[in-house]
Interface confidence: medium
């Protein structure tokens, strides 16, 4: 009724002293490798020469912190961020930060990033769109209420309003340039 070698589970590491033989009823607890978190029970039990239980480790890391327009990241850059890791932003001058200056990786998701807005209500350059561009020469700063128009590249169709407007330091939603369906 004893159990022999411990079962192995992906990204899970058995804790404590390893033994050749485990008595019936004995429990072994597993811990997860870096970037992973236990989902459910963390132990297995020896019952009738077999191990019962299945510790599951799931990846809770994050990659690619959110991009914040008119801001740059001032904390260390990593290829992979463990859950609980934080990334701090700073707004480029003259933009002002709204929201928490940091984002945190929480169980595989980033918390919401701040926004950098011009406190005077001005806007930065219009947002770029795939397969399209603005029809005027892009400026670095736009006055409140100013507008720009987009046009699509050949063979692409514009969806949405081609004109966007600067309001409260933010551009309205830009259009999309979609490839027409070929029949």
């Amino acid at each position: 009724t004893d159990c022999l070698s411990l079962p192995s589970f992906e990204n899970a590491i058995p804790m404590g002293e390893k033994k050749d033989v485990y008595k019936a009823g004995e429990q072994v607890t597993y811990t997860c490798a870096t970037y992973y978190k236990m989902d459910g029970a963390s132990n297995v039990t020896c019952i009738n020469s077999r191990w019962t239980g299945r510790p599951t480790c799931r990846d809770t890391s994050c990659v690619n912190p959110p991009t914040v327009q008119n801001a740059y990241i001032v904390s260390r850059q990593m290829s992979k961020y463990p859950s609980g890791e934080r990334v701090r932003y700073q707004c480029r001058s003259p933009y002002e930060m709204f929201g928490d200056e940091e984002v945190m990786c929480l169980n595989g998701n980033w918390t919401e990033p701040p926004q950098c807005k011009d406190s005077t209500g001005k806007c930065g350059p219009p947002p770029p769109i795939d397969n399209g561009d603005i029809t005027s020469f892009p400026l670095s700063v736009y006055a409140p209420a100013s507008s720009v128009e987009y046009q699509c590249q050949n063979l692409y169709q514009l969806e949405g309003n081609k004109r966007i407007t600067c309001r409260n330091g933010q551009w309205s939603e830009p259009p999309k340039c979609l490839h027409p369906c070929v029949i």
Partner: antibody, heavy 118, light 112 residues
Amino acid sequence: QVQLKQSGPGLVQPSQSLSITCTVSGFSLTNYGVHWVRQPPGKGLEWLGVIWSGGNTDYNAAFISRLSISKDNSKSQVFFKMNSLQADDTAIYYCAKNGDYGYTMDYWGQGTSVTVSS
Amino acid sequence: DVVMTQTPLSLPVSLGDQASISCRSSQSLVHSNGNTYLHWYLQKPGQSPKLLIYKLSNRFSGVPDRFSGSGSGTDFTLKISRVEAEDLGVYFCSQSTHVPFTFGSGTKLEIK
């Protein structure tokens, strides 16, 4: 100025659910998260969860199975719902704005006093 | 969860005196990015809590400079250099280094 105003019932029957609305002004829910914290009578503060500005939520693991936080950005309202209340859930429930620095709670609602009793 | 232990539970002071409140965490609050996410709140009788100090030692907007926060790792202190009547209430330390965020049990500052 920043304000958070709470509305909700004072008395909840055991095993019933609690719903509280937090209506905010002076800031936008598209820019700031809102936390929920409770305080049992004569006791300390307990963090329950948060809804971030993008709408994603994080809950205290002790409450994850019976807690739901949602919001309506256009109405500047955050909704808190907790199921299966028992006597030990009797507390003052607060909503609080996420601060600008390191996940603080920089402005708080006036609190909703909730008694769980039949 | 990180346990925050505050001492004393009650702190009788005379107006004008210095007050010191201690807070200890069950694990280090120093984040891997070097910041310490330890904050202090004050709850006056019948009111909601208010943020006093954030990230160890930074005074929140409008908080008088008689309030100061210090400490490192797992041991933290809030000092009030000259206690005024408006400072009376319950002080809570709180951490947001680890999820779930947690609070201390509170220290009641009262007149001696």
